[in-house]
Interface confidence: low
């Protein structure tokens, strides 16, 4: 969630005399933004999956989309503005650095970082968020994107329980996955997702989507996508919208079959997949038997597993 | 040679549940890829695709008749039964059973169909 | 869900006679299109998968084409035992759906 984006002014300076009384105000002014920040967050939180379902459900209805689009956003726009303008206030008072804030990798491009790789975003306070290592893609599509999930090597199982998925597991420049509470933060602020997908034969494709939201743990990390583009054939996604995240511990599925452990990963599982993008890695010779494997329905169908997948997303006002 | 043969009561009454029976020859349902799908069809009308389940037991439904059905099957016993609930007259129809071969969700061998009539 | 037209609901022809049967699909559906085969009081036979690929045994006059959103099956030249219902099915994504139907009848 991009919460400041404008430029934080300089620290006014302190007149010696009254220097304590105002830092004392200054502490108590900060402590009250902190806490209605806070309450404006788990507000926020509670309210911002209703208003994605709102939105993705006016994409659809073409008459009637642009009104309701228009005030689901300005809804959610109002709510962010108000977190803005707190975190604004309280960021003068306590900080310089805010305005050098970084939340993703897009904020990395803005700031001219424009090599693909490993980044440390810092903790953010506000949010509550630690310090992550993440993998930016500052090329393809114009760049700013943060990577999500790799298969590429086959070294890191992906048959893992909720915690894992949780918290995120893998080695960050191989085969990974960042997290979901790590995906769901990302994703608080309008963001997009691209799926890119290469076979054993050396073909490439993407889908991409205008929409994504990844839910909070009590909503178990439901996966929220809007319009499709792309060129790999079908929209192997979408049989997924909507959809709570299941692992071989927790089924959240929609099927009488615990479609997590049928499939061997953890996913967006409905009964069972059109895509299994965290499957098992099959290499070359094994890579067309299985169902269980990394698989885009309608590409090469439901028993090819892919040779190398990449999730990544960006907000979606980004501007190269 | 490949066969497929529904089997079922033809008369239902209303709000009763009907189970139908697909007993195959030819072709094994442990083989992976292999499906079988049910799809019914009411007299004069179009075809309706209902249910499909695999060798691997993945299973899939059509999202209105979706709390009405049940797909299992038996792989040793060489049959895939469906239970219907809640049984209506505009349920009247032949019921089909198919065999889907690869993942491309299409039915390229057909039982004969077995006619149902849901009346009181 | 993705509903499929099929167009026109009946047709008459005459034996010898070249005929296309179209269907459109509500959205975007690639190649995964079927064709089927219906006579009267008979279970449906594939004709075409994959919008295009023929099916063992059926005759090479039967042919199918289109990707996207618009389809057509043709027939060459039409033999008396063509005269049937033919209907499209999606392929793309569950729930599967067929078209309406199109009525060959003999002129």
């Known amino acids: 969630q991009k919460l400041s984006k404008h430029k934080t002014p300089a620290q006014p300076q302190l007149k010696a005399a009254n220097c304590c009384e105002e830092v004392k105000e200054l502490k108590a002014q900060v402590a009250n933004l902190s806490s209605l920040l806070s309450e404006l967050n788990k507000k926020q939180e509670r309210d911002w999956v209703s208003v994605v379902m709102q939105v993705m459900e006016l994409e659809s209805n073409s008459k009637r989309m642009e009104s309701r689009l228009t005030d689901a956003e300005s809804k959610y726009s109002e709510m962010n503005n108000q977190i803005d303008i707190m975190q604004l206030q309280a960021a003068q008072t306590v900080t310089q650095t805010s305005a050098d804030a970084i939340y993703d990798c897009s904020s990395l491009y803005q700031k001219n970082y424009r090599i693909s790789g490993v980044y440390k975003l810092p903790p953010d306070d506000f949010l509550g968020s630690p310090e992550l290592e993440v993998f930016c893609d500052m090329e393809t599509s114009g760049g700013g994107w943060t990577i999500i999930q790799r298969r590429k090597s086959g070294l890191v199982s992906f048959y893992r329980d909720w915690k894992q998925y949780k918290q995120g597991f893998g080695s960050i420049r191989g085969d990974f996955w960042l997290g979901n509470e790590h995906i769901h933060r990302l994703s608080r602020q309008p963001t997009r997702l691209r799926v890119e997908m290469e076979d054993w034969e050396g073909n490439l494709r993407y889908a991409e989507y205008s929409h994504f939201v990844l839910g909070n743990e009590l909503n178990s990390y439901r996966l929220f996508l809007g319009n499709y583009t792309g060129n790999v054939g079908n929209d192997a996604l979408q049989y997924h919208n909507n959809t709570a995240f299941s692992t071989k511990d927790k089924d959240n599925d929609n099927c009488l079959d615990k479609c997590a452990q049928l499939r061997k990963g953890g996913y967006w599982y409905n009964c069972c997949t059109d895509s299994n993008l965290n499957g098992v890695y099959y290499r070359l010779g094994e890579h067309n038997k299985h169902l269980d494997g990394i698989t885009w329905y309608g590409w090469h169908g439901s028993t090819y597993s892919l040779k190398r997948v990449e999730m990544k997303i960006r907000p979606e006002d980004f501007k190269p | 040679q490949i066969t497929l043969k529904e089997s079922g009561p033809t008369l239902v009454k209303p709000t009763q549940t009907l189970t139908l029976t697909c007993t195959f020859s030819?072709?094994?349902?442990?083989?992976?890829?292999?499906?079988v799908g049910w799809i019914r069809q009411p007299p004069g009308k179009a075809l309706e695709w209902l249910a499909l389940i695999y060798w691997n037991d993945d299973k899939r439904y059509s999202p209105s008749l979706k709390s009405r059905l049940t797909i299992t099957k038996d792989t040793s016993k060489n049959l895939v039964v469906l239970t219907m609930t809640n049984m209506d007259p505009v349920d009247t129809a032949t019921y089909y059973c198919?065999?889907?071969?690869?993942?491309?969700?299409?039915?390229?061998?057909w039982g004969r169909g077995t006619p149902v009539t849901v009346s009181s | 869900d993705i509903q499929m037209t099929q167009s026109p609901s009946s047709l008459s022809a005459s034996v010898g006679d070249r005929v296309t049967i179209t269907c459109r699909a509500s959205q975007g559906i690639s190649s995964y299109l079927a064709w089927y085969q219906q006579k009267p009081g008979k279970a449906p036979k594939l004709l075409i998968y994959?919008?295009?690929s023929l099916q063992s045994g059926v005759p090479s006059r039967f042919s199918g084409s289109g990707s996207g959103t618009d389809f057509t099956l043709t027939i060459s030249s039409l033999q008396p035992e063509d005269f049937a219902t033919y209907y499209c099915q999606q392929s793309f994504s569950t729930p599967l759906t067929f078209g309406g139907g199109t009525k060959l009848e003999i002129k």
């Open positions: 994959a919008a295009s």
């Open positions: 198919a065999r889907d071969y690869g993942d491309y969700w299409f039915f390229d061998l």
């Open positions: 030819g072709f094994s349902l442990s083989t992976s890829g292999v499906g």
